[in-house]
């Protein structure tokens, strides 16, 4: 089986300097910072039914999300 | 739902500034990386900059020195000024913004013509 | 900057064909056990739709008949079997550093 997108957020990141679980690592500025600051997918609230937005990101597997987690499973690398 | 539109002059006059804006809703301009992208008539894409979350900018080194990126949080709009234009600068102008975390531009605007003509 | 040269410029078919398009980045787009490449459909008058990103991951309500592959500097889009909604043109862009790029592009038009 294919294994789904790696994602940049967390716990099971490698060294040298893994995110804390409420940050993200961008790319960009390459360090971490507030997930907040970042478009993360947002979870859904149960039983929600209206339609997603017509290209937002979706992995077309599951990897695994730890609870509590966006749709993205993001572990925070570097 | 988010949503990007872009807004400004269709025609602008060699040597002078292009400015557009880009009117945002159903997020805020204060998270995330927004995008200035343009695409002469029947041609390629070419990557203008992004204004970020924290106010910080980035222009494509090709077009750096003739190009600002800014914002109006208040009104939730992010903006392009293009100096010194000539016709090579007719393109359509798109806003867009990427997710995280694989920077794919997942968001565009409709796009505006902007032609340069005297 | 990192340059993503596609082809075939044109690609000719005929609808329930597959259809196969190539991007080749000028070096590799992988990042931190990710490929940073990503596909994009135009149409005439519309702007770019995202249909694949991270080389192989389908966005929100395409249809399961695009497939993305590949890793480092090769890349791949398939059309399992072509709709008459698919021709269009195709970009690939790659967001591994800034300046991002596009490719400039697969036209599939019908044969």
């Known amino acids: 089986m294919r294994r789904g997108p790696r994602s940049l957020r967390g716990r099971d990141a490698p060294a040298p300097t893994p995110c804390v679980p409420a940050e993200c690592f961008d790319l960009l500025v390459r360090h971490c910072v507030a997930c907040g600051l970042l478009r993360t997918p947002r979870p859904k609230p149960a039983g929600a039914s209206s339609p997603a937005p017509r290209t937002a990101l979706q992995p077309q597997e599951s990897v695994g999300a730890g609870a509590g987690e966006a749709a993205l499973p993001l572990p925070g690398l570097l | 739902q988010v949503q990007l539109q872009e807004s400004g002059p269709g025609l602008v006059k060699p040597s002078q500034t292009l400015s557009l804006t880009c009117t945002v809703s159903g997020d805020s301009i204060t998270s995330g990386y927004w995008n200035w992208i343009r695409q002469h008539p029947g041609k390629c894409l070419e990557y203008i900059g992004y204004?970020?979350?924290?106010?910080?900018?980035y222009y494509n080194p090709s077009l750096k020195s003739r190009v600002t990126i800014s914002r109006d949080t208040s009104k939730n709009q992010f903006s392009l000024k293009l100096s010194s234009v000539t016709a090579a600068d007719t393109a359509v102008y798109y806003c867009?913004?990427?997710?995280?975390?694989?920077?794919?531009?997942?968001?565009w605007g409709q796009g505006t013509l902007v032609t340069v003509s005297s | 900057e990192i340059v993503l040269t596609q082809s075939p410029a044109t690609l000719s078919l005929s609808p329930g064909e597959r259809a196969t398009l190539s991007c080749r980045a000028s070096?590799?787009?992988?990042?931190?056990?990710?490929?940073?490449l990503n596909w994009f459909q135009q149409k005439p008058g519309q702007a770019p739709r995202l249909l694949i990103y991270a080389a192989s991951n389908r966005a929100t309500g395409i249809p399961a008949r695009f497939s993305g592959s590949g890793s480092g500097t090769d890349f791949t889009l398939t059309i399992s079997s072509l709709e008459p909604e698919d021709f269009a043109v195709y970009y690939c862009?790659?967001?591994?550093?800034?300046?991002?790029?596009f490719g400039c592009g697969t036209k599939v038009e019908i044969k």
């Open positions: 204004i970020s979350y924290s106010g910080s900018t």
């Open positions: 867009a913004s990427p997710n995280y975390p694989f920077y794919a531009m997942d968001y």
């Open positions: 862009q790659q967001s591994k550093e800034v300046p991002w790029t």
């Open positions: 070096e590799s787009v992988d990042n931190y056990g990710i490929s940073f």
